[in-house]
Amino acid sequence: PEPPTACREKQYLINSQCCSLCQPGQKLVSDCTEFTETECLPCGESEFLDTWNRETHCHQHKYCDPNLGLRVQQKGTSETDTICTCEEGWHCTSEACESCVLHRSCSPGFGVKQIATGVSDTICEPCPVGFFSNVSSAFEKCHPWTSCETKDLVVQQAGTNKTDVVCGPQDRLRA
């Protein structure tokens, strides 16, 4: 018969023959022959292969380096890599999460639109008219200006995006 030019799913072509790939969690030791099946071996401790493969070496589990602010979010298995995340107050610098940086704080005049997570930084927004923030914070939203009217007071000093309004007593009409 004609040697194959393509193989079925979970097979690979070698020496004009279709051999079975090794299942996830196992590596290739020897190719199949006309008389023998593909020989595979389980990955060792702290190693993994996450797909049907013909790799002769397993991948090392990712190391979540605490010196880079990393910690283990999910321990790796023979079929999955370790997933790292960042310590509290820090977030990953890339999709692969290889290092962490401190969450940014929103400066006075800006409030937190979205609090940071282990994988995304703080998102700040400028305080709109009627709101202010007088602190640098990774958690504080813009606060509304104090309503002097509800306290039977009047505005003595207008608010800005960084300061609250200053309320004072209403001027008494002189006799």
Epitope: A6, Q11, Y12, V29, T51, W52, E55, T56, H57, S94
Partner: antibody, heavy 117, light 112 residues
């Protein structure tokens, strides 16, 4: 220091067999898959084939039968059985990241093969 | 065979700007992330920038960022510098296909 160096590239006439050699230093061929990639003048990169740590060779469909990859303990060879003018290119020997056959982190400088009558 | 299609073929960018290069695989790469990005300058061999779609290779500046999964991938270069002028290639891998590895056609980045 881990390095690769290709040799054997020269001007040959069509049909004249040619063997390119990749000499490795600083690492063991029992730990790394080795791949050949070529690049025709002014063109893109083309994956040719690889030989893995247990000595199994895999080829691009267009390269099967036209090229043979083999290795010793310190070198990898690419034999061009019957070159044509379309095989004129710089041939790179490359090393993969362990376990990642498509991620080539060490490249040789390349050797130029010119096939012309 | 897995086929990699890169767009655009050429891109002109100013210093300090951000450039995005796309790479599409004809079928899902292994583990949905077996994709690498390379940078090549004239007269030099290519240099590995990113592997497994988003992992930065040793010594590569964090201005280079890889993202994507399955069949759609992106290389983003932010704060472009003159030294980034080069041709960039993606390469995908799928063990079940005869042509297990394949390169994209390349994207030339010109820095103004």
């Amino acid at each position: 220091c881990q390095s690769l160096e290709e040799s054997g590239g020269r001007l040959v006439t069509p049909g004249t067999p040619l063997t390119l050699t990749c000499t490795v230093s600083g690492f063991s061929l029992s730990t790394y898959d080795m791949t050949w990639v070529r690049q025709a003048p002014g063109k893109g990169l083309e994956w040719l084939g690889l030989i893995n740590t247990i000595g199994s060779a895999y080829y691009a469909s267009w390269a099967s039968g036209r090229f043979t990859i083999s290795k010793t303990s310190t070198s990898v060879t690419l034999k061009m059985t019957s070159p044509t003018t379309e095989d004129t290119a710089t041939y790179f020997c490359v090393r993969g990241v362990p376990g990642y056959s498509s991620s080539f982190n060490i490249w040789g400088p390349g050797t130029l093969v010119t096939v012309s009558s | 065979a897995i086929v990699m299609t890169q767009t655009p073929s050429s891109k002109s960018v100013a210093v300090g700007d951000t450039v995005t290069i796309n790479c599409q695989a004809s079928e899902s790469v292994d583990s949905n992330k077996r994709l690498a990005w390379y940078q090549q300058k004239p007269g030099q061999p290519p240099k590995l920038l990113i592997y497994t779609a988003s992992t930065l290779a040793s010594g590569v500046p964090s201005r280079f960022k890889g993202s994507g999964s399955g069949t759609e991938f992106t290389l983003t270069i932010s704060d472009v510098v003159c030294d980034d002028a080069a041709t960039y290639y993606c390469a995908g891998y799928k063990a079940t296909t005869t042509d297990a590895s394949a390169f994209g056609g390349g994207t030339e980045v010109v820095v103004k």
